[in-house]
């Protein structure tokens, strides 16, 4: 058992032209976090199961806001290591995927939005207990600098964390046949329980008597490198010492295939058979397939198993992005009509409609006047999700049921007195004024300024408003 540790040193624009835009802005401040996924190197089983060695998520980094006009600098990083504990032997060869995620901290409804900024992948050979290994990986215009190591958890030691150490029974030396445990010199190696002769460097066991080989080693005692040439090689002079044909130089010598690819000669040159997740002439290009589990938030992955295969993620409602990594604020599209209130419930959208409207998007204007009668000869007028009555003369109120006081609004001008009448109102004008509302002054010479009084009606007499 042990722990794989990853230290991110920097994440920022890579060298060369085409510097990426800062992922954060004054309007949308954000912070970064990282995800690491580990798989054992050449294991077929592990290639199918995502992150079979383990995975880890970093803490969130400090909030970052872009300075307008400034180029994107290295972005502020989360504190601490990413640690991936492993329970069994350290495999020696492993694949990694490191993802850089952005958490947007704007005023998103429903919480922050996450989006994948960059993803790097690779395959490495690494002995447990060794020093930190430094690496630089590029993803598009971004560059990620990091270090990693694998360390054993006591009592395990060794390059695969398979040898066990115990405190010394005697103060001065270890028991017969047992070595001190480097670097824990005050402890001794526990008695071996593996098959006798099993290589302590390249083999390990989980049960007494067995000898299981690390990646790249074979044979009953894990002492034979997988790449050892066969004595049946068709080229080269015979070796006097071994009787084997020693291979001459060939296109596969030195193995031009990267990332654990295996080389085979062709009539003209060589061909690399790449492990899952890598492709290219020399297996130098790393690819992501559905086997890597790239779809988030319940997205379904569509694609083939070959490293060259594309993939797409079929996203559930409420998520978008090439990996379904971004939450959609579906209410920002203002789907509710007629002033309805939008509610994003995650699994569905709901519109809460104003009075007088209905339908999934409040698109139906209800017939406000249906079944509503206006009393006393009033007529119903629709509008704005509510009905109102236009009342006949002498009536008022919501349904025209109330008798109106026509004098309440003081309709008679210039001090005229108002009288309610069955057909409306009558104004008794003050001296010097005339008209239905006492609105016209009577001129001193006796001639009215405006319409002449009808015959038989003297100025000053009450005038009925008809």
């Amino acid at each position: 058992a042990g722990v794989f540790e990853l230290q991110i040193h920097s994440f920022g624009p890579g060298p060369g032209p085409g510097a990426p835009r800062s992922p954060c802005s004054a309007r949308l401040p954000c912070r970064l976090f990282f995800r690491v996924c580990l798989k054992p190197g050449l294991s077929e089983e592990a290639a199918e199961s995502p992150c079979a060695l383990g995975a880890a998520l970093s803490a969130r980094g400090p909030v970052y806001t872009e300075q307008p006009g400034a180029p994107a600098p290295d972005l502020p990083l989360p504190d601490g290591l990413l640690q991936v504990p492993f329970r069994d032997a350290w495999p020696g060869t492993f694949s990694f995927i490191i993802e850089t995620w952005r958490e947007e901290l704007g005023d998103q409804i429903g919480g922050p939005a996450w989006s994948l900024l960059a993803r790097v992948a690779g395959r490495r050979r690494l002995a447990a207990g060794g020093p930190w290994a430094r690496d630089i990986q590029r993803a598009g215009a971004w560059e990620l600098r990091f270090s990693y190591r694998a360390r054993c958890e006591p009592p395990a030691v060794g390059t695969a964390c398979t040898r066990l150490c115990r405190p010394r029974s005697a103060p001065s030396r270890c028991g017969p046949g047992l070595r001190p445990c480097a670097p824990l010199e005050d402890e001794c190696e526990a008695p071996l329980v593996c098959r006798a002769g099993c290589s302590p460097e390249h083999g390990f066991c989980e049960q007494p008597g067995e000898c299981r080989c690390l990646e790249g080693w074979t044979g009953p005692l894990c002492t034979v490198p997988v790449s050892t040439s066969s004595c049946l090689s068709p080229r080269g002079p015979s070796s006097a010492t071994t009787g084997c044909l020693v291979p001459g130089p060939g296109p596969c010598d030195g193995n031009p295939c990267a990332n654990g690819g295996s080389c085979s000669e062709t009539p003209r040159s060589f061909e690399c058979t790449c492990p899952r997740g890598f492709y290219g002439l020399r297996c130098e290009v790393s690819g992501v397939t559905c086997a890597d589990g790239p779809c988030f938030n319940g997205g379904l992955c569509v694609g083939g198993a070959d490293p060259d295969s594309a993939y797409i993620c079929h996203c559930p409602p409420g998520f978008q992005g090439s990996n379904c990594e971004k939450r959609v604020d579906r209410c920002s599209l203002q789907p509710c009509r007629n002033g309805g209130l939008c509610l994003d419930l995650g699994h569905a959208l709901r519109c809460r409609c104003r009075a007088g409207f209905a339908g999934p998007r409040c698109e139906h204007d209800l017939d406000d006047c249906a079944g509503r009668a206006c009393a006393n000869g009033g007529t119903c007028v629709e509008g704005g999700g509510a009905h109102r009555c236009s009342c006949a003369l002498g009536f008022g109120g919501r349904d025209c049921r109330e008798r109106a006081d026509p004098c309440a609004a003081r309709p008679c001008a210039h001090g005229g007195r108002c009288y309610a009448h069955f057909s409306g109102l009558v104004c008794a004008c003050a001296p010097g004024y005339m008209g239905a509302r006492c609105e016209f002054p009577v001129h001193p010479d006796g001639a009215s300024a405006l319409p002449a009084a009808p015959p038989g009606l003297r100025p000053g007499d009450p005038q009925r408003y008809l």
């Epitope: 569509v302 797409i312 993620c313 079929h314 996203c315 559930p316 998520f319 379904c324």
Partner: nanobody, 115 residues
Framework: EVQLVESGGGEVQPGGSLRLSCGPS????????VGWFRQAPGKQRNLVAG???????NYAQSVKGRFTISRDNAKNTLYLQMSSLRAEDTAVYYC?????????WGQGTLVTVKP
């Protein structure tokens, strides 16, 4: 049962172009993820190009810059424009669509690239 029907396959010389069509079909709607798979003799079936239900497009590394996938939701049709064709592009090309419940496949159309 509703089927997807491909057309546009055939024989072409290296460097040539072809345009594959799939549909029209009521299956090809904007709420579905759609794509083109291909299968060469003795090989696995792999996604060449796809468009997800949220509009993200992706291509196999070997066809990037040469193939273009597009969909016409009004015509319920999916297209694959293939140019600069190579011998290794020879395969049966299958139209594909899916929603959360179902997957739909076409019968395939053969594309042969040879001098």
């Amino acid at each position: 049962e509703v089927q997807l029907v491909e057309s546009g396959g055939g024989e072409v010389q290296p460097g040539g172009s072809l345009r594959l069509s799939c549909g029209p079909s009521e299956i090809i709607t904007s709420d579905k993820s759609v794509g083109w798979f291909r299968q060469a003799p003795g090989k696995q079936r792999n996604l060449v190009a796809g468009i997800s239900n949220v509009g993200s497009t992706n291509y196999a590394q070997s066809v990037k810059g040469r193939f273009t996938i597009s969909r016409d939701n009004a015509k319920n049709t999916l297209y694959l424009q293939m140019s600069s064709l190579r011998a290794e592009d020879t395969a049966v090309y299958y139209c594909y669509a899916r929603d959360f419940e179902n997957e739909y496949w076409g019968q395939g159309t053969l594309v042969t690239v040879k001098p």
